[in-house]
Every structure is written in C-alpha cells, then in structure tokens.
C-alpha cells in the first residue's frame, strides 16, 4: 500500500484537525522542553507543506518519509544542543537511526513544573478567547509530560476537555460543573498514560512476541466467543497499531487504529455481542469504547481443556509442528475460560505449559511426563489469589492512606536505594489498588489488582532505568515481564543496605505545612516515613506507627497555634529527639 507522498496520504486520511493535533503531540513528546509557541510554529510549517503535497504529490520533498520530514524539522530547532545536550547528536544520524535516537532520549520524568489549575473564570475566558490555542496547549502540556501517551487516545481526551469547557462555561455554577470533570480527566489521563507506558515498555524491552502474548490473553478474555483466527487477526492489527505509536509513527498509528475500529464494527458478529453501543459513536469515542469494552459472556458449552492439551497423544506432535501457534491456541483457550485470572497469571501458565512440553517432549514417555501439567498450575494460581485476599483485608482494615503507608514501609525495606520521591509516588499508586479493586466481586478482583500492579511497577522500572541504583530492581525489571510483580513481592528486607545517616533537616517542618492540601500533607508525611525507614530499616511497625502518630499530633498542634512558625521551631526539635529515642 505505497503512496507517492506519505504525508499527503496521511493528511487526507486523518483530516487537517487530527493531522495537526497528532503532529503537535509527536513534536511535544520528542522535544519536551521546547516552548509551546515553537512547537505551534513547527506544526504550522509541516501542515502547510502537507497541503502542498496534497495539491501535487510530485512536488519537491513530498516523497520523503514522515520521519525524514519530521526529523528534519525538529533538527532546525536553534537551541537543541543547549536545551537537550547529547540528544542533538541524533541530528547527525540518518533515518531510521535518527528517529530511534530521538525515541531513546524521551524522558519519562521530565523536569517540568506541575500543572497548576487557574481559577475557573480565567480558564473559561481563555477558552472563549481562543478555543483552538487553548486545546493545543492542552495537547502540548499533556504530551510533553507523558512522552508515551497513546496519541489517538489523547485526541479523545482533548475532545472531552473541549466538551467540558463548552458545557460548563455556560453553567450557572461553573466550578461545580467543571472541576469534577477536570479531576476525572486528570485521573483517567494519568491511568491511560501509565497503561500505554507498559505496552511500549513491553515492545521495547521484551519485543513483539511478548506484546502479542499479552494481547492474545486479553482479547481472548474480552471476546471469548470469537474464533482463534479472529483473535489472531485482531492481535496482529493491534500489535501494529501499538508498535507504530510506541515508535513515534503517530499518524500511521491513528490511521491504523481507525481502520481497526472500522473492521471490528463491520465484523461484530464474529467478535463480540458487546460492541454494538460502541459502533454508533463518532471515531475517537468509538475507538476508546472498543478498547474499554467489557468482557463478552463465555460460550456455555466450552469443553475441558485437558482433552487437547493433556490427554491427547498428539500434544508433542502438534507442539513440534508449530510451537507458537500451538501455544497461542493454548493461551487463547485458557484465557477465554478465565476472565477471573489476571493477564499476567495467564501468561505465567502458558510459560509453565511451554516449559513442561519442552522438557517432556524430549522424554522417553512424553505423555506420562506431562500428564500432571495442570496440577503444576495450582501454586501459580493460588499465589496471586492469596496476595489479593491478604492485601484487600489489610486495605479494608487500614483505609487508603494507612494502606499506602504500609506499602511505603514494605517497599522501602525491599529497595531502600531507590529515591524517596520515586518510592513515595510508586507506593501511593500501589496503595490505590485497594480502592480500585477490593470493592469488586471476587471474580474481578485478581485481574483488576494484578494487572494494575503491573502498570504501577512498570513506572518504577522506567524511572529506575533512567537512574539505576538497585541491582534487585534491575533484576526484577529485566528478567521477565510476566514475573515482575511476583519478583517484587518476593523481595525481603535488604540486609546489605547501609542505613542512611540521620539528617535533622529532612525532619524539619515549617508553617507552610498548614496551608497544604490534604494530598500534599500526606505526601510530606509519607516522604518523612520513607526517610525514617531508610534511617532505621529494621524499625518495627509499632515503632514507626508511634512516630507517625506523634508526627500527625505535632503538625495538628502547630497548625492550630497562633504563632505557627514559632511552634514548629520549638516543637520540631522535640519531635525529632523523641523519634530518635523511640527508634533507638
């Protein structure tokens, strides 16, 4: 499917609005420090050029690849060397090395100020004054902070952002209308970014096969009535879409995602009964809806798996003839029967089955050797079941904040070398699994919890890769994608760690503590808790609880005082001394 001009092809397929949005996202994800105006200028230049190619596909440079066109444009940025350092060296390379060089310099934790939300009236004025600029700014600010955000999905978020302002800026109580919508978009956006980051990490670090295995398992759970061939076709197409987006080919990705949505809606009967309501929606909403669609009901008459995968005498013959296909069918059959299992568990089971066949098909009596293979699955299934049960009980007993604190202590003891901000961010997010999953019925708890934990732990892995400090983290992150969570769960107190020297400055607080939001106060306290554990890794739960209770009392007391700063100055050193004594 070759075109004389790739840029003209994509412009015509996507339309001007989506074309411009996607190019802005691409540029913002590559050059995360560039000012908004600079990116808008580059996007406008590319768009004007694309229009000349639409008018005449044989015009000069219209035959160049998108990466060549976009890369050449990015390499015109005057301050590249000063702003980005060695990333500027990418410009000396030729395509496709240049693009992959840019991709490798994407920063998962860019040094950008947190986005502050202006007053509602200020935002509504800005929206009405220049709607187009307002929405472009949203795309830019999100994309540069989330360099792997799924680009076509970000266009959907921008459409919802626009709809929220269009509705709420007309409302009697603008704030009551708008703020909950913005909070929801922020939270959903962060979750979407983290989920996509795991997909890209899977493709980057573990490759095509790992992603396809994940997709077979997930789509088989969603579409248990679909044939294996249908699921395989969807997996191939979905892998292409995500490979393109993760590779920076955002126009191709958006185009192929639209094609996939079209295909799914034209073939609902052979995929799932749940697609109907998605397929009536406009493109961006439709694609989002299809991605989030609930699992279809399982066919009633599914036979036991044992017949084909354990009892049959042809297991080794079928395996040897086409290993990937046979294992793919096993994964499909197991996953469609088990919407109650996490995708990661299903992949572990497939891996265990493969290992058994590798061993047994070389044995004197293969059938005898693999006859009990399903029994070997039991401990693999029970491990996440027990973990979810125990942690949900703990969450219900403690509530979210204290559950997060328990995880902070647990993870700081496991990997105390990791930076405090990373431990706080990751543990707070691990703790959110409680509110997200523990309220669900039993059959939905494990897929919710373990697959969410995989997303959160991937964040730890990408942050740690940027600044590696712990061999244990490196090992858990790199050895096996499907065993990351069990690997972290199995880590114990790091006995080799030399406790951090006590620094009074770390535990010195001021009156500004009192004006912080509840969330910011929690983060401050949790930061102190991590530092405490780094100082005293062998402190007991009771000791830490005592110190944290004293801390909360001390802050509450000083925030009620007339002279808050004087109180912090006087009570702070007392708190530090008492804490040191309690932990001695």
């Amino acid at each position: 499917d070759t075109h004389k001009s790739e840029v003209a092809h994509r412009f015509k397929d996507l339309g001007e609005e989506h074309f411009k949005g996607l190019v802005l996202v691409a540029f913002s994800q590559y050059l995360q420090q560039c000012p908004f105006e600079e990116h808008v200028k580059l996007v406008n230049e590319v768009t004007e050029f694309a229009k000349t190619c639409v008018a005449d596909e044989s015009a000069e440079n219209c035959d160049k690849s998108l990466h060549t066109l976009f890369g050449d444009k990015l390499c015109t940025v005057a301050t590249l060397r000063e702003t980005y350092g060695e990333m500027a060296d990418c410009c000396a390379k030729q395509e496709p090395e240049r693009n992959e060089c840019f991709l490798q310099h994407k920063d998962d934790n860019p040094n950008l100020p947190p986005l502050v939300r202006p007053e509602v009236d200020v935002m509504c004025t800005a929206f009405h004054d220049n709607e187009a600029t307002f929405l472009k700014k949203y795309l830019y600010e999100v994309a540069r902070r989330h360099p792997y955000f799924y680009a076509p999905e970000l266009l959907f978020f921008a459409a919802r952002y626009k709809a929220a302002f269009a509705e709420c800026c007309q409302a009697a109580d603008k704030a009551a209308c708008l703020l909950p919508k913005l909070d929801e978009l922020r939270d959903e956006g962060k979750a979407s970014s983290a989920k996509q980051r795991l997909k890209c990490a899977s493709l980057q670090k573990f490759g095509d096969r790992a992603f396809k295995a994940w997709a077979v398992a997930r789509l088989s759970q969603k579409f248990p009535k679909a044939e294996f061939a249908e699921v395989s076709k969807l997996v191939t197409d979905l892998t292409k879409v995500h490979t393109e987006c993760c590779h920076g080919d955002l126009l191709e990705c958006a185009d192929d995602r639209a094609d996939l949505a079209k295909y799914m809606c034209e073939n609902q009967d052979s995929i799932s009964s749940k697609l109907k309501e998605c397929c009536d929606k406009p493109l961006l909403e439709k694609s989002h809806c299809l991605a989030e669609v609930e699992n279809d009901e399982m066919p009633a008459d599914l036979p036991s798996l044992a017949a084909d995968y354990v009892e049959s005498k042809d297991v080794c013959k079928n395996y040897a003839e086409a290993k990937d296909v046979f294992l793919g069918m096993f994964l499909y059959e197991y996953a469609r029967r088990h919407p109650d299992y996490s995708v990661m568990l299903l992949l572990r089971l497939a891996k265990a089955y493969e290992a058994t066949l590798e061993k047994c098909c070389a044995a004197a009596d293969p059938h005898e050797c693999y006859a009990k293979v399903f029994d070997e699955f039991q401990p693999l299934v029970e491990e996440p079941q027990n973990l979810v049960k125990q942690n949900c009980e703990l969450f219900e007993q403690l509530g979210e904040y204290k559950f997060q604190n328990a995880l902070l202590v647990r993870y700081t003891k496991k990997v105390p070398q990791v930076s405090t901000p990373t431990l706080v961010e990751v543990s707070r997010n691990l703790g959110k699994v409680g509110a997200k999953c523990c309220k669900l019925p039993e059959a939905k708890r494990m897929p919710c919890a373990e697959d969410y934990l995989s997303v959160v732990l991937n964040r730890l892995c990408v942050l740690h890769e940027k600044t590696p400090v712990s061999e244990k983290v490196t090992k858990c992150c790199t050895e096996s994608l499907v065993n990351r969570r069990p690997c972290f769960s199995a880590l114990e107190l790091d006995e080799a760690y030399v406790p951090k020297a006590f620094n009074a400055e770390t535990f010195t607080f001021h009156a500004d503590m009192c004006t912080l939001s509840e969330k910011e106060k929690q983060v401050k306290k949790q930061t102190a808790l991590v530092e405490l554990v780094k100082h005293k890794p062998k402190a007991t739960k009771e000791q830490l609880k005592g110190v944290m209770d004293n801390f909360a009392a001390f802050v509450e007391k000083c925030c009620k005082a007339d002279d808050k700063e004087a109180c912090f100055a006087e009570e702070g050193p007392k708190f530090v001394a008492a804490s040191q004594a309690a932990l001695a």
């Epitope: 991709l103 490798q104 980057q204 490759g207």
Partner: nanobody
Framework: EVQLVESGGGLVQPGGSLRLSCAAS????????MGWFRQAPGKEREFVSA????????YYADSVKGRFTISRDNSKNTLYLQMNSLRAEDTAVYYC??????????????????WGQGTLVTVSS
C-alpha cells in the same frame, strides 16, 4: 544459542554489485528479527537493513534505500543482502545480527543478541 556466519564480501568497483549471505544455525524461529550492520574504520557501527523473520517486513537506512535489498530464505535459514550501485562510502565490515525478540528499536545494535564475525566489503577502483 544461535550461530551466524557471513560470506560474500570482497573487492568491487564503484557501481558494481555484491550479494552477502548469512547462514543461521541453532534455534532460530519465527519471532526473530535479522539485520545487517556495518562498521567503517574509525566509525561507529551503523544500521543498514533488517527484516522480520515472521512477516518479511523490511527496514532500510536512508543511505542504502533503493540500492540494497534484504531477503531471507526460511527453508535454508539464510539471510541475504543484495548490494547494487555500490559506492566508495559503502566500504566497511558488514555484520549479520539476530534479535530473538524483535524488540521495538531495530536500528539499535544492543537489541541484537547474536552477531556474526563480519565480512569485509571494499568498494574501490
């Protein structure tokens, strides 16, 4: 373990052609991506071309696009690089490489776990 053995290098005049071969033995399977890289004296190793063993999708460096063609023969477990319209700047040691996982970044040498010993291509009159 996978072993890769290149052959077909040699001296050729500018404008001439050569066909490099890379025989793979061991446990190659359909998930592999195979690639050609080259290294000229005093320069970094650079990406030339790659192919997905599974679907036959090909990738080329801009500098060789239209002149070089990568292909594979699954039955012989052999990778080829047909090089036409050779130029002096194509002079280098050419390496065959295999990435058993088909990771996302196909131009990055670190993503290829297995390497051949290299074959020298000299383009000179």
């Amino acid at each position: 373990e996978v072993q890769l053995v290149e052959s077909g290098g040699g001296l050729v005049q500018p404008g001439g052609s050569l066909r490099l071969s890379c025989a793979a033995s061991g446990s190659t399977d359909s998930a592999y991506r195979m690639g050609w890289f080259r290294q000229a004296p005093g320069k970094e190793r650079e990406f030339v071309s790659a192919i997905n063993w599974s679907d036959g999708r090909t990738y080329y460096a801009d500098s060789v696009k239209g002149r070089f063609t990568i292909s594979r023969d699954n039955s012989k477990n052999t990778l080829y690089l047909q090089m036409n319209s050779l130029r002096a700047e194509d002079t280098a040691v050419y390496y065959c490489a295999a990435d058993p996982d088909s990771r996302l970044y196909y131009t990055v040498p670190q993503n290829y776990d297995y390497w051949g010993q290299g074959t020298l291509v000299t383009v000179s009159s």
